[in-house]
């Protein structure tokens, strides 16, 4: 996260840490007791590796009553998702169990209206990805808000060049941005998970490269047909 | 202690502009979004927009585009509005507000103290 | 826009009564604030995100509701709660206040 702070602490309950082999590799969000939503580019390159999911954590090396270390069960990318595209950048963990839920550890609504967030509308995104431009890798659960951005402006050829589609979303990222490591994390807004940080290695912070994130409306029926 | 301290009332004639301030003390100012709202007669409060003051991006309410202007001053911490073209629809309290937490439920934690714009010729 | 209408627009109760007053939005949210505003004062933020009361704010206060409809409640009335109360949207910009209920006291 780029010019953020860091976050009140277990008060994002949903929050997730998609670990590979005992080291912080993306965000993710708890969506259902048994179940992370994270970003499929997020798991490209862990094929041999060990990947779990933290919850109930804002340090990811201080012991803390909430924590825990999840297996997982079952990797699920979306089925069109692909190596070389930003598009369909969706995956659900299934937890080896059901999570422990508690103050700290709370799966996020999500939303399921297919409409796009309003520009302007100021979102909320969080994660343990880098904090400045050296590559810092923060302890704490770091936030910033953000503000939406219409597509069109995003779209545009010195921008992302007609690349955002209905399924994708745009946030400003005038030196406020999410950044590498924040990929698989939640944008909510009003509340309500309405992205998934796309996990592709967009430059940060240049206003001119605004973040992207998936519609997670878009993907409703996908989603629901996989928790099921 | 975080505060926002306003500047005083204005009276200002039509069609002319006003430039209020909301300096903001306790707080890092940077960090976090400034909004605007006006509350006329009949205590209706409308929501003009916002400005963050650690890039300048802000965005307004549709029915304020054109109306008014929102800018800051990082080495001050202080944000402004203007207000252009002035008609008796304008008079009103204007308010800074922010929000300093970092839950991800944020709301308008913090009021400047209101300014009065009176428009009258 | 999501515009949020308040009832009553006036509420008379004494003290130790139970009141509850109502926020209904035009379309859908997921949560709602609420500001309490006495005369010559700046708003103050009394309950944020439906039903967490902000700091300060006695527990004789409470909130609920979800989708359009929102309420507040105060358990057992006061003197110092006479106010105007306004319910708050920030699901979408832009972001809209009710036109807000005010609490006497007989």
């Known amino acids: 996260i780029l010019g953020g702070r860091e976050a009140e602490a277990h008060a994002r309950p949903y929050m997730a840490s998609v670990q590979l082999n005992g080291a912080h590799l993306c965000g993710g969000v708890l969506v259902a007791e048994q179940w992370v939503l994270s970003a499929a580019h997020c798991l490209e390159d862990a094929a041999d590796g060990k990947v779990q999911v933290l919850l109930g954590a804002h340090s990811l090396s201080q012991p803390e009553p909430s924590k825990r270390l999840y297996d997982v069960l079952r990797a699920v990318p979306h089925p069109d998702s692909q190596p070389d595209t930003i598009d369909h950048d969706l995956l659900l963990l299934q937890l080896s169990e059901k999570a422990t839920l508690g103050p700290a550890v709370r799966p996020l609504p999500w939303q399921r209206v297919d409409r796009d967030v309003a520009p302007g509308t100021l979102c909320d995104v969080a994660g343990w990805g880098i904090v400045n431009h050296a590559g810092r890798r923060p302890d704490s659960l770091q936030h910033v808000l953000l503000p939406v951005l219409d597509r069109a402006t995003c779209n545009r050829r010195t921008h992302h060049d007609g690349a955002i589609t209905e399924r994708l979303m745009c946030a400003e990222s005038n030196r406020r941005d999410s950044c590498k490591g924040d990929s698989g994390g939640p944008l909510v807004c009003g509340g309500v998970l309405e992205g998934v940080v796309t996990s592709g290695s967009r430059v940060c912070g240049n206003r001119k490269k605004p973040g992207i994130y998936t519609r997670v409306a878009s993907y409703a029926a996908w989603i629901d047909s996989v928790l099921a | 202690e975080v505060q926002l301290q306003q500047s005083g009332p204005e009276l200002v004639k039509p069609g002319a502009s006003v430039k209020i301030s909301c300096k903001a003390s306790?707080?890092?100012?940077?960090?976090?979004?400034m909004h605007w709202v006006k509350q006329s007669h009949g205590n209706i409060l409308d929501w003009i927009g916002y400005i963050d003051p650690y890039n300048g991006v802000s965005s307004y309410n549709q029915k304020f585009k054109g109306k008014a202007t929102l800018s800051v001053d990082q080495s001050s911490s202080t944000a402004y509005m203007e207000l252009r073209s002035l008609t008796s629809e304008d008079s009103a309290v204007y308010y800074c507000s922010s929000y300093y937490g970092s839950s991800p439920y944020w709301y308008f934690d913090v009021w400047g103290t209101g300014t009065r714009v009176t428009v009258s010729s | 826009q999501i515009v949020l209408s308040q009832s009553p627009a006036i509420l008379s109760a004494s003290p130790g009564e139970k009141v509850t007053m109502t926020c209904r939005a035009s379309?859908?949210?997921?949560?709602m604030h609420w500001y309490q505003q006495k005369p010559g004062s700046s708003p103050k933020p009394w309950i944020y995100?439906?039903?967490n009361l902000a700091s300060g704010v006695p527990t004789r206060f409470s909130g609920s509701g979800s989708g359009t409809s929102y309420s507040l409640t105060i358990s057992k009335l006061e003197a110092e709660d006479a106010a105007t109360y306004y319910c708050q949207q920030w699901s979408s910009n832009p972001y809209t206040f009710g036109g807000g209920t005010k609490l006497e006291i007989k």
């Open positions: 306790g707080y890092s100012f940077t960090d976090y979004y």
């Open positions: 379309s859908s949210v997921s949560y």
């Open positions: 995100a439906t039903s």
